[in-house]
């Protein structure tokens, strides 16, 4: 298969509500009409799939119903949002992009975005 460059930010800090967003940009060598995007998490040398979506160029990304990810696409950019994150989910989140159709098939894998998640401190009890 053919290689393709994928760029993503090096570091992202999740919000206090456990939401992290980042852009995954790919250098499309051709005019792909069908694209698959996969987010993988690498931590302690283990790799797990977080979510995956396919989309037709110009349309919304379609994730599975139970996915913790949402996203939108614009040209060769995919705006990804991961929700429900906790401190234990801190790790390197790698964006993988495949140009599925038309041929040839292209595959690009980003260097990863280190997402830091800090669990919010519980609110102190009030005396009021």
């Amino acid at each position: 298969c053919k290689a393709m460059h994928v760029a993503q930010p090096a570091v992202v800090l999740a919000s206090s509500r456990g939401i992290a967003s980042f852009v995954c940009e790919y250098a499309s060598p051709g005019k792909a009409t069908e694209v698959r995007v996969t987010v993988l998490r690498q931590a302690d040398s283990q790799v797990t799939e977080v979510c995956a979506a396919t989309y037709m160029m110009g349309n919304e990304l379609t994730f599975l119903d139970d996915s913790i990810c949402t996203g939108t696409s614009s040209g060769n950019q995919v705006n990804l949002t991961i929700q429900g994150l906790r401190a234990m989910d801190t790790g390197l989140y790698i964006c993988k992009v495949e140009l599925m159709y038309p041929p040839p098939y292209y595959l690009g894998i980003g260097n990863g975005t280190q997402i830091y998640v800090i669990d919010p401190e519980p609110c102190p009890d009030s005396d009021f």
């Epitope: 290689a3 996969t38 993988l40 790698i94 595959l107």
Partner: nanobody, 119 residues
Framework: EVQLVESGGGLVQAGGSLRLSCAAS????????MGWFRQAPGKEREFVAD????????YYAGSVKGRFTISRDNAKNTVYLQMNSLKPEDTAVYYC????????????WGQGTQVTVSS
Amino acid sequence: EVQLVESGGGLVQAGGSLRLSCAASGGTFSSYGMGWFRQAPGKEREFVADIRSSAGRTYYAGSVKGRFTISRDNAKNTVYLQMNSLKPEDTAVYYCAAEMTGITGWDYWGQGTQVTVSS
């Protein structure tokens, strides 16, 4: 070192069926993502279908959706491609591929098996 060996190709008439097999040796097959690709003479290599190690989720190219089915038998270290309602444009060499982690791409490829669909 992972080795992939395809079988099941051949000559079939349009509308017919074939089942391709890809036997893997070496490594932990159940953790691999497995895929099928094809390449027709003078054309670029084309994605056909794949099956993820996680939950066995499948994905198909639009051109084969509804006609081809990918499946795996982890006990036999084998992935299959059931091809029904074959068309002359399905004629190609079909390659099996394996990805170890998902972050290194398709790490291993078979030698391919020829499928010819006559009209």
